[in-house]
């Protein structure tokens, strides 16, 4: 799997996960949030050489016709696979609120 | 949604489906497949800016990301979202047979 | 500059629901709470509620709650206010605002207003 | 909910100070108010916020005050402009809250 335990330990310029730490208030501008400060989403990134973690039918077909046609511009792109919730503290007036944010961190990444 | 219907009738440099015909012999070397010759892959490229049908919680915050952060690396991706199966025809010896291949077809494309 | 433009004026029969549109330009829209405060001659200013973009989470004013409904489109940097089974009380000026930053917050920039007439 | 009471109306002359006051049903802390400026048929303009901070632009003849209970928006040397309706706003509980407002007119 092109998960943190692949990819954070091997040098990859294939598709695979990087880690990226977002601040909520310098990076997204959201000052709402109270707690974390900020998270690690990490992102996917990389080339989708021949048949790279391919996905689906469809991405093998597409990387084994960019095999035989290299001036050809359809390629698949390295996408998140497997995503993880984050747990934030916010607050509604002097009220806190806890709230599971779906779908905010990258675990594993895929050739699409 | 980033289908045909949209796609293919507007000039879009920004994620969107595109049209791939595949003929199997010619671009894949695939010499099993009796009918049909080919088929309309098609398949999905182009830029994904600012919350350009960004598909996941993830795919949105990368794209805020990347409008505060304009010099990163970790932006979304265009990929396939809905695919369909493609029914073939081939060979056992004599004997014909007919298959269905899963996820052969980009029906529509996303941000990821 | 900042610009939060509101559909126009409407009227509506009791029963019937209307939508309202904030259009925000000259920031960036995913960065800030989005509320939405109405204003009557009797009643004064209530407000109704907040939504934050991207992620959705919305806030309610238990008075309003089970007939407000408030969403923020990204794509568009469009929020939306959607006020259902309308009442001759309903009768007001609509206004979308932006927040400093927090959930509840004081609201720096308004829009122009959206007259809503409820009257069969 | 929290109330806030304002005066309906206050009057003061041309240069002189107006304090309008806005006293909260229960105690918000020192951070959870603004006042707002409304002139006819336009949007409310944030004038103050926080404990003490002024919005970009309004002039520094405008000052807030807070203690908690009792909140003061005060106007030194107040100008023909200033004429307008005045309403504070709590966003220290939900529902925020605003006052009735306070019609300043100015002689």
């Known amino acids: 799997a092109l998960d943190a335990a692949y990819c954070f330990r091997n040098v990859q310029d294939n598709c695979c996960l990087r880690p990226l730490y977002i601040d909520f208030k310098r990076d997204l501008g959201w000052k709402w949030i109270h707690e974390p400060k900020g998270y690690n989403a990490n992102f996917c990134a990389g080339a989708c050489p021949y048949l790279w973690s391919s996905d689906t039918q469809h991405s093998r077909v597409l990387s084994l016709y960019n095999t035989i046609n290299p001036e050809a511009s359809a390629s698949p792109c390295c996408v998140s696979q497997d995503l993880e919730p984050l747990t934030i503290l916010y607050y509604i007036g002097k009220t806190p609120k806890i709230e599971q944010l779906s779908n905010m961190i990258v675990k594993s990444c895929k050739c699409s | 949604a980033l289908d045909a219907a949209y796609c293919f009738r507007n000039v879009q440099d920004n994620c969107c489906l595109r049209p791939l015909y595949i003929d199997f012999k010619r671009d894949l070397g695939w010499k099993w497949i009796h009918e049909p010759k080919g088929y309309n892959a098609n398949f999905c490229a182009g830029a994904c800016p600012y919350l350009w049908s960004s598909d996941t919680q993830h795919s949105r915050v990368l794209s805020l990301y990347n409008t505060i952060n304009p010099e990163a690396s970790a932006s979304p991706c265009c990929v396939s979202q809905d695919l369909e199966p493609l029914t073939i025809l081939y060979y056992i010896g004599k004997t014909p047979k007919i298959e269905q291949l899963s996820n052969m077809i980009v029906k529509s494309c996303k941000c990821s | 500059q900042v610009l939060l433009v509101q559909s126009g004026a409407d009227v509506r029969k009791p029963g019937a629901s209307v939508k309202i549109f904030c259009k925000a330009s000259g920031y960036t829209f995913s960065s800030n709470v989005m509320h939405w405060v109405r204003q009557t001659p009797a009643q004064g200013f209530e407000w109704m509620g907040s939504?934050?973009?991207?992620?959705?989470?919305?806030t309610y004013a238990r008075r309003f709650q089970g007939r407000l409904v408030l969403t923020a489109d990204t794509s568009t940097n469009t929020a939306y206010m959607e006020l259902r089974s309308l009442k001759s009380a309903d009768t007001a000026v609509y206004y979308c605002?932006?927040?400093?930053?927090?959930?509840?917050?004081?609201?720096?920039?308004w829009g122009q207003g959206s007259l809503v007439t409820v009257s069969s | 909910d929290i109330v806030l009471t304002q005066p309906p109306s206050l009057s003061v002359n041309l240069g002189q100070t107006a304090r309008i006051t806005c006293r909260a049903s229960?105690?918000?802390?020192?951070?959870?108010l603004a006042w707002y400026q409304q002139k006819p048929g336009q949007a409310p303009k944030l004038v103050t916020y926080g404990a003490s901070s002024r919005a970009p632009g309004i002039p520094d003849r405008f000052s807030g005050t807070n203690s908690g209970i009792t909140a003061t928006l005060t106007i030194s040397g107040a100008r023909a402009e200033d004429e307008a309706d005045y309403y504070c706003q709590q966003y220290a509980d939900s529902p925020i809250t605003f006052g009735q407002g306070t019609k300043l007119e100015i002689k």
């Open positions: 605002a932006r927040t400093l930053g927090l959930v509840l917050d004081a609201m720096d920039y």
């Open positions: 939504v934050i973009p991207i992620v959705d989470i919305a």
């Open positions: 229960q105690s918000l802390g020192s951070s959870y």
